[in-house]
Interface confidence: low
């Protein structure tokens, strides 16, 4: 069937349109185009005779039409009047006629629109504003944008006049925005420049800052007033109803009790004609006395005595506050406050309760602090410590031992050897010792104020032979690239040299290896798997030497990035797929597989028999080391070709 297609259907003025003919019959004599929906000689545009290839213009020909041998008609430089129907009249060689009708619509290219407004300075909650999109254009659609967004749904927004007019009822300050209108027709769209709506509002109720209403005599009063307003508000201050000044800030230096009263800020907006006021009541106080602390026990004994601290002077209707170590009181069952908070009781004091303690008196305005008080808590003695820590000595050297025990007041010391009292000093000195000086050395510490005593016993061995050393470690299973390990050679002996060997060799030079504590401690920073070796320490003096048994470091590492073998990525259908995954790790990792993201078995080897092209995809091996808490994975693409075809490379191969 003969049909006409208009390309395009909607045509812009000045552009062109092609009336394209489909299913044109064979064996034609000629054809003719007419304006309208029927054949009318008065409205003929152009005729065409195939035999002569001659085109003949008709009464409706405008000089803008071109007819093609395939009967299609091109109309150029389209005008509004071209809108409508077009009829093609086809005359076949057997003089049988056939007709078809097509149509198109013509629209103007739209000009850039602009926005007109009926009110350039509307007042909040009072005025309405009507925006109109100019010019008025036939067959055009009007759209509106607020801050480059489509119109929000609001009962205060109304479109009228075919959406050409946007009315905002009862404008608010939030309507201050960028407004644009847009005109559209089927062939063009244009957007206006933005119009900013300037809404007059306020003043809102002013706020007076700062908020505090209580001041001390002698301070400066500096009040500031602010009210949201457009245009900005004008401010006035009144004190007890009397006008003071027309400024936003009110400053009164060196105030007295007489400056107490009501302070009013008035905000005025000259454009809206509105006034708003806020009142604050200011109270000025005279200075209170400085507090001080008294105590019922100046030298309490640890774990025995209680102490009551009292804040003086006693003032009626006053709030008392306490601080310990410059912090508010901690929650503790050993701390108790009296009903009026004036007395703080410490039950069963400890050495940590020394303070300092402060109390404060709070008036309506501020807090006055006392001077700090420190408690002299009597404690100790604790278990004494004997230094140095050596237990082995060579004959002929001097033995010098020192004793210390935490105590208040400081402890008095006594030394005993094998239970026999030696001297009442903090230090014990014996020159040129022999094997006979081996024995039990006891330090006794005594606190004369509390009457308590404590002792510590140390075994001293005097011998020419050094004992066999041993290695202690602070970390038996360090994690690679994370942990450090400190080996210590035991025991600690006087005038002794400490040596280290790794795998039977002396220590390599490395910034990760550090000797300390007189070479007695060997620290390995940021251990690696290569540090998993045998470590031996040795001790020697001028007459003997000895070595420890080896200690092997067990370094946890990995898992490293796994390797999937074999490396092939292309397989023939029917083959067996046998993928093995390996990752360096200590301890051995756990393995799992995923095919195309779907979890499979938790094994090191993935086996699929007689694969088909359905087995194409990504094969991922995941490894995890529970000891190091680390994971790793690798992905491999597998392509399976049907038997008999040459397997190509897969994507990602």
């Amino acid at each position: 069937k003969l049909t006409i297609e208009s390309t395009p259907f909607n045509v812009a003025e000045g552009k062109e349109v092609l009336l394209l003919v489909h299913n044109l019959p064979q064996h034609l004599f000629g054809y003719s185009w007419y304006k309208g929906e029927r054949v009318d000689g008065n409205r003929q545009i152009i005729g065409y005779v195939i035999g002569t290839q001659q085109a003949t213009p008709g009464p409706a020909y405008s000089g803008r039409e071109i007819i093609y041998p395939n009967a299609s008609l091109l109309i150029q430089n389209i005008i509004q009047n071209d809108t409508g129907f077009y009829t093609l009249h086809v005359i076949k060689s057997d003089l049988v006629n056939e007709e078809a009708t097509g149509q198109f619509r013509v629209y103007p290219e739209l000009p850039k629109p602009s926005i007109s407004s009926n009110n350039s300075k509307p007042v909040e909650d009072k005025d309405a504003v009507a925006f109109t999109c100019e010019p008025e254009t036939q067959d055009a659609t009007y759209l509106w944008w607020v801050n480059n967004q489509s119109l929000p749904v609001s009962p205060r927004l109304q479109l009228s006049n075919g959406n050409r007019t946007l009315t905002l009822f009862n404008v608010t300050r939030n309507d201050t925005a960028s407004y644009k209108c847009e005109t559209q027709n089927p062939v063009s769209a244009r957007r206006s420049d933005s119009v900013i709506l300037n809404v007059l509002y306020g003043p809102d109720a002013p706020t007076i800052s700062p908020l505090n209403t209580s001041y001390r005599s002698g301070e400066n009063l500096n009040l500031s007033c602010h009210a949201a307003s457009n245009p900005p508000a004008q401010y006035s201050w009144f004190v007890n109803g009397t006008f003071q000044q027309s400024t936003q800030e009110l400053f009164i230096p060196n105030i007295t009790v007489n400056n107490s009263g009501s302070y009013t800020c008035q905000a005025h907006n000259s454009d809206t004609g509105l006034n708003r006021t806020t009142v604050t009541t200011i109270t000025v106080y005279a200075e209170p006395p400085k507090p001080f602390i008294t105590s019922n026990n100046s030298n309490p004994v640890e774990d025995e005595d209680a102490v009551a601290l009292t804040c003086e002077p006693e003032i009626q209707n006053t709030t008392y506050l306490w601080w310990v170590n410059n912090q508010s009181l901690p929650v503790s069952p050993r701390l108790q406050l009296s009903n009026d908070n004036r007395t703080l009781t410490l039950l069963s004091v400890t050495r940590n309760d020394v303070g300092p303690y402060e109390c404060g008196i709070q008036n309506e305005l501020s807090v006055d602090h006392s001077d700090p008080v420190i408690l002299n808590v009597l404690y100790g003695p604790d278990d004494p410590t004997i230094s140095p820590s050596y237990t082995y000595y060579r004959p002929g050297v001097n033995l010098s031992l020192s004793c210390h025990a935490a105590s208040n007041p400081p402890a008095q010391y006594s030394w005993l050897i094998d239970g026999n009292i030696q001297q009442h000093t903090q230090e014990l000195f014996i020159s040129n010792i022999t094997e006979k000086n081996s024995g039990l050395y006891t330090c006794q510490a005594n606190n004369s104020a509390s009457g308590h005593s404590r002792t510590t016993v140390k075994t001293i061995t005097v011998s020419a032979e050094l004992p066999k050393p041993s290695i202690s470690s602070n970390n038996s299973k360090p994690v690679e690239d994370k942990d450090a390990v400190a080996f210590t050679c035991e025991p600690e002996a006087q005038n002794t040299t400490y040596l280290w060997w790794v795998n039977g060799q002396s220590l390599p030079v490395s910034p990760r290896l550090q000797l300390s504590n007189g070479n007695r401690t060997l620290t390995l920073f940021n251990v690696t798997r290569n540090d998993a070796r045998a470590y031996v320490c040795g001790i020697q003096n001028s007459v003997s030497a000895n070595r420890s048994d080896p200690v092997t470091l067990d370094v946890l590492y990995g898992p490293d990035t796994p390797i999937i073998s074999p490396p092939d990525s292309s397989y023939l259908s029917g083959a067996n797929l046998n993928l093995s995954c390996h990752s360096a790790s200590n301890p051995s990792p756990q393995y799992s597989w995923r095919i195309n993201g779907i979890p499979q078995q938790h094994t090191q080897v993935l086996f699929i028999a007689k694969i088909t092209p359905n087995n194409n995809g990504t094969y991922a091996c995941f490894v995890s080391n529970l000891a190091t808490g680390r994971n790793n994975s690798i992905v491999k693409s597998i392509t399976v070709s049907a038997s008999g075809t040459s397997p190509g490379l897969s994507a990602g191969a």
């Epitope: 195309n596 990504t618 992905v635 693409s637 994507a651 990602g652 191969a653």
Partner: nanobody, 119 residues
Framework: EVQLVESGGGLVQPGGSLRLSCAAS????????IGWVRRAPGKEEELVAN????????RYADSVKGRFTISADTSKNTAYLQMNSLRAEDTAVYYC????????????WGQGTTVTVSS
Amino acid sequence: EVQLVESGGGLVQPGGSLRLSCAASGFNIKDTCIGWVRRAPGKEEELVANICPYHGYTRYADSVKGRFTISADTSKNTAYLQMNSLRAEDTAVYYCAIVSYVDEYYNYWGQGTTVTVSS
């Protein structure tokens, strides 16, 4: 914070070349797949190319095959789109995006760089 910053767009004549860069921060591009998405007025959004640096997988839309090449430098954490034999229909805003390896769905993209092909 995950960020993708595109650069390299501009005006070029038909048949010319451009190289777009996508600098990633806040994540490692070898842990995911990166794609280039283009948007042109009146046309459907199109994923023109994507790459999964971890295993070297690449994919191209039919409209750019043989003309565009996607690559990645994991040491610089940057993806590239080399565009040769540019045509007028390649005019668009090009966005760098994080792309799902499985279904090529993209859920995060940068601010875009404009490519205009015109004589």
